[in-house]
């Protein structure tokens, strides 16, 4: 006759508050005759969790039909789990006896522990923008998880980062834990469209990690390059001068023209275009009247980008005698 084995396959069962826990128990033999009961804890003070034949256990249901002949599955489900339900659960076989049934064999036990899912990771970037080639720090926080074991990874555009530091608090026993990680990211000029991702993996997430993201567009400032050029062709007695402001981010930009140090108030034509990398180009045209102009006209294009110190480019206007003749010819 085969010796009875009580099989409880899970050593640890993580459950979430409010959910249903399934505790597995199978037997390898139908003998001896007698019931299988579920207890939490051991010794005389152990708590009866389920007795099929008598008592009131409204939160407990059986996984299979215990009344079926030759049933060997005594697994149970406990609904509406609360923190009070944690502990080690044992399925115990009793042999029918008189006056009392006699405990025959116990399963090894399944420890039920509360598993709490981590909150969605929140990623925060630096307070101020930084230019490319510099390093910025991003922090990622997630709270309220249990057990303490957790994995956090950082990615930049899908590439895993290695320069980060992570802390899980508290260090001792607790009902819930928090994680905080700080990653150091070197900014590239093309990072306007880049993202950093903080990925959190935890046993309660069943292989589906949580992610928090931050756009590097919030952290980067790409300063513009300036070029001032004079167009070779003139329109009547006017020469067209162009100021090209290239590859800047963010869009916030103020452009002013000065003629021989005097700020010009008149309207100028301009266009804004966005580059594939997310940076912007700004082109401004300035028409200079060359009739009776001296040769020493200096034009300045000054740009104040994102509240930074102004940068400027100057152009000494080249007006040839030929151009002067043309302009005087054009004057009625």
């Amino acid at each position: 006759e085969e010796e009875l084995q009580m099989i409880q396959p899970e050593k640890l069962l993580l459950v979430t508050v409010g959910k249903t826990a399934t505790l597995h128990c199978t037997v390898t033999s139908l003998l001896p005759v007698g019931p299988v009961l579920w207890f939490r804890g051991v010794g005389p003070g152990r708590e009866l969790i389920y007795n099929q034949k008598e008592g009131h256990f409204p939160r407990v249901t059986t996984v299979s039909d215990l009344t079926k002949r030759n049933n060997m599955d005594f697994s149970i489900r406990i609904s509406s789990i609360t923190p009070a339900d944690v502990g080690t659960y044992y399925c115990v076989k009793f042999r029918k006896g008189s006056p009392e049934n006699v405990e025959f064999k116990s399963g090894p036990g399944t420890e039920m522990a509360l598993g709490a899912k981590p909150s969605a990771p929140v990623v925060l970037g630096p307070a101020a923008r930084t230019t490319p080639e510099h390093t910025v720090s991003f922090t990622c926080e997630s709270h309220g998880f249990s057990p303490r074991d957790i994995t956090l990874k950082w990615f930049k555009n899908g590439n895993e980062l290695s320069d980060f530091q992570t802390n899980v608090d508290p260090t001792g026993q607790s009902v819930a834990y928090s994680i905080r990680s700080t990653a150091r990211v070197v900014l590239d000029p093309w990072d306007v469209r880049s993202q950093v991702i903080c990925e959190v993996a935890h046993v309660t997430l069943q292989g589906d990690p949580l992610r928090g993201t931050a756009n590097l567009s919030e952290a980067i400032r790409v300063p513009p390059t300036l070029e001032v050029t004079q167009q070779p062709m003139r329109v009547g007695n006017q020469v067209n001068v162009t100021c090209q402001v290239r590859k800047f981010y963010p869009q916030s930009l103020q452009l002013t023209w000065s003629e021989n140090g005097n700020v010009c108030q008149r309207e100028t034509a301009s266009t804004l275009t966005e580059n594939k990398d997310g940076t912007y180009n700004w082109t401004s045209w300035f028409l200079v009247n060359i009739s009776d102009q001296r040769d020493d006209v200096v034009l300045t294009c000054q740009v104040k980008h994102d509240g930074q110190l102004a940068v400027s480019k100057r152009l000494a206007l080249e007006v040839t005698v030929h151009q002067k003749d043309q302009s005087s010819d054009a004057t009625p």
Partner: antibody, heavy 113, light 108 residues
């Protein structure tokens, strides 16, 4: 819905035997212990015994041992309690209950000469 | 056998008052096996509290149960008119199963 319907009131003479039935519906009695409880007029509850209808195993309180027989018929889903050698102090309401949670309405047994 | 002694035998209180009913066992009873029943005249007992402290379905939250070992208590925080009845404690920890003699909760 779980229901336990007991047989009607009985009047018996001392020394006689009474057999009370408890018909169950909404569940199979084979799956539960069926208990019997006595309540004498103006007195408290007293556990008589129980049966496991699955294998007819019984347990009785020492006070009733030898005079009481609890049986069950799983084909009709009915439990029975038979009390013999009746005496006046057996005058009481007898309740059946399923696994200590659901109770029948009670059967009054009057023992009088 | 385990003898359950309930006290007081009768408790006279007014609606709104707090009621404390005690049940003392002659030997230790695991909390899982201590139940309370309510019974009103002419009615069958009703399961009221199971496993020492768990309220049966539909029982108002003003009722609570506590205790361990040999001393158990049923408490009603603020009595309502429908609470006046007889309450029995019951152990099914070992055979023979036993009941306390009951506490009659009556209106003062």
């Amino acid at each position: 819905e779980v229901q336990l319907v007991q047989s009607g009131a009985e009047v018996k003479k001392p020394g006689a035997t009474v057999k009370i039935s408890c018909k169950a519906s909404g569940f199979n009695i084979k799956d539960y212990y069926m208990h019997w409880v006595q309540q004498a007029p103006g007195k408290g509850l007293e556990w008589i015994g129980r049966i496991d209808p699955e294998d007819a195993e019984t347990k009785y309180a020492p006070k009733f041992q030898g005079r009481v027989t609890i049986t069950a018929d799983t084909s009709t889903n009915t439990a029975y309690m038979e009390l013999s050698s009746l005496r006046s102090e057996d005058t009481a309401v007898y309740y059946c209950d399923r696994g200590l949670a659901y109770w029948g309405q009670g059967t009054l047994v009057t023992v009088s000469s | 056998e385990i003898v359950l002694t309930q006290s007081p035998a009768t408790l006279s209180l007014s609606p709104g008052e707090r009621a404390t009913l005690s049940c003392s066992a002659s030997s230790s009873v695991s909390s899982s096996y201590l139940y309370w029943y309510q019974q009103k005249p002419g009615q069958a007992p009703k399961l009221w509290i199971y496993s020492t402290s768990n309220l049966a379905s539909g029982i108002p939250a003003r009722f609570s149960g506590s205790g361990s070992g040999t001393d158990f208590t049923l408490t009603i925080s603020s009595l309502e008119p429908e609470d006046f009845a007889v309450y029995y404690c019951h152990q099914w920890s070992s055979y023979p199963y036993t009941f306390g003699q009951g506490t009659k909760l009556e209106i003062k």
